[in-house]
Amino acid sequence: WELTILHTNDVHSRLEQTSEDSSKCVNASRCMGGVARLFTKVQQIRRAEPNVLLLDAGDQYQGTIWFTVYKGAEVAHFMNALRYDAMALGNHEFDNGVEGLIEPLLKEAKFPILSANIKAKGPLASQISGLYLPYKVLPVGDEVVGIVGYTSKETPFLSNPGTNLVFEDEITALQPEVDKLKTLNVNKIIALGHSGFEMDKLIAQKVRGVDVVVGGHSNTFLYTGNPPSKEVPAGKYPFIVTSDDGRKVPVVQAYAFGKYLGYLKIEFDERGNVISSHGNPILLNSSIPEDPSIKADINKWRIKLDNYSTQELGKTIVYLDGSSQSCRFRECNMGNLICDAMINNNLRHTDEMFWNHVSMCILNGGGIRSPIDERNNGTITWENLAAVLPFGGTFDLVQLKGSTLKKAFEHSVHRYGQSTGEFLQVGGIHVVYDLSRKPGDRVVKLDVLCTKCRVPSYDPLKMDEVYKVILPNFLANGGDGFQMIKDELLRHDSGDQDINVVSTYISKMKVIYPAVEGRIKAHHHHHHHHHH
């Protein structure tokens, strides 16, 4: 019996087609992805093959203005239109709190939404009961297929699930649900979830009875043969894991942003054992036409987005200096504003010992592309912020050793004075540079804001300590020459859309007045500073 699994993950609000790098589509003839194009391909496969499942491994939420405006209603509407068979909850599905998941998505989705390792407690338990499930048994042709869901147990640190959801260890939670499916004589089981490729592989290895793992969160691109676009494969598709009980378990993921449609064919024997598995992600490029009816619906929904872009989010009473002359040479108040917004967006009081789990932010000055003038009645709009942050990136959470951070700050000023983009703006960090010293030895003081404290204060950076830092995904991926971040990071979780983070902060604050306040100091002559 042959099953075709079509899968997406980490689509992040890319409802419209995008450019090759998943940013805004500029030249339509070279654009990719989008739900209209995805639907064309899905329908083509559904017509050609008998037993097809369309699955999503989470993080549909968050990423473009579509989510900012429609808050998940767009996800439910278009996933319903594409007739998804099931979805696993990702961490970003909790970005607007539990209510922001229940009302727009859980109550509106015409497909089951799954997670076995999220347990509701207290008053939420009855409110959310039945709206998401640990598993679902789906009939496909003459057979049934069990799908068990899972979600990153780091979600409380990455999003806003509140205090009434408990995120259990994935493997511990999945095993009893798979066992239940076995007692229902369901012998073909897919684990569908959102915990990243490393956990996907562990699930394949450790959870008895799982036949296939369809994952997300780590935006992993797998491919067999010559890859069709810019993404470099992390391994073959499918990636085969040998389970502890000796089975070959295919593990798949389909990069992100709706650029590819994962396509996996599995052959099962009559006892539900996987005999063979093969496939590849399908690049959704312009050779695949956009479905006209879905496209028309997208265009109808788009109208509200254009109106939103020009509405006032809040006011500034000071000039927001986002000029390259400032932000690539010294502390600029636009950099401070953005970093403050980034920390504010990551306030998660999950432990009494910590005022917050993260206090530090770094931001490449070259990523700040425009100032905002206060003399326009102080008005700040989404359109203004899109000029400041035009790349459609995310502000991510990483864990780094102090030594890596020190290298990053050395890199920040290694060729100071040439208006290069790597000059770092900061939050929760005080840095002093001596630019008269040779490159690679210019950081003379680096103090960081404590987290395990009731009164936050600055302490010298410790080289061997592991720190959490919020930064643009561009830096996490080694952009602007920050290779040491990419190479040495201990953990990387993708965060919220950059503009959305700043716009939410401005809306919350109503009136802003960021200052230049001595976070970054530099001098060109020897001072008697102690090395740290």
């Epitope: 015409k110 048994v137 789906l138 239940k180 007692t183």
Partner: antibody, heavy 118, light 107 residues
Framework: QVQLVQSGAEVKKPGASVKVSCKTS????????IYWVKQRPGQGLEWIGW????????KYNEKFKGRVTITADKSASTAYMELSSLRSEDTAVYYC???????????WGQGTLVTVSS | DIQMTQSPSSLSASVGDRVTITCKAS??????VAWYQQKPGKSPKLLIY???TRHTGVPSRFSGSGSGTDHTLTISSLQPEDFATYYC?????????FGQGTKLEIK
Amino acid sequence: QVQLVQSGAEVKKPGASVKVSCKTSGYTFTNYYIYWVKQRPGQGLEWIGWIYPGNLNIKYNEKFKGRVTITADKSASTAYMELSSLRSEDTAVYYCARDDNYAWFAYWGQGTLVTVSS
Amino acid sequence: DIQMTQSPSSLSASVGDRVTITCKASQDVSTAVAWYQQKPGKSPKLLIYWTNTRHTGVPSRFSGSGSGTDHTLTISSLQPEDFATYYCQQHYSTPFTFGQGTKLEIK
């Protein structure tokens, strides 16, 4: 709350057909199976078949195959069971039921009595 | 098809009694057994599924046990509203099948 409301009692002649409806509310229709169950007067329960409205997959008990057709109208959140070439042994109460996660029948309609009599 | 044989087919008991109904499957059904209660002229009501999991709102006096081929429904202390017909069902494989019923009457 979850509700399944069935159409009213029917009296039919042998050889005729009957179509029983099951209108659902209080939940997402596409996300749960609808099962049909037969109960002859004073007798036990027999599973006729299912429909999964999400992908309109239908499975019949071999015993009922050929004369039973199960359908669903997603827009009306309603399932239907049609029984053709009626005979006297089809006289029974027909129930629709919903799962709460596959294979057991958590919520039931009130039943529809179909009487086949010449 | 899997046959489910219930016993007894009827039994008389008094309020406060402990009552046990058994169900034997013609082949191994693991723990995939449900129990229903039906009163005259009414639809069946789910009591227990997966052998021993009580459905929402079902009183704790109802319990289930067993695995493989032998399964049991126990009512620990009969209440007046418990007099009804009880059916077991295997939810292990299609076609899903029911026992022939056990009618519980007042002694």
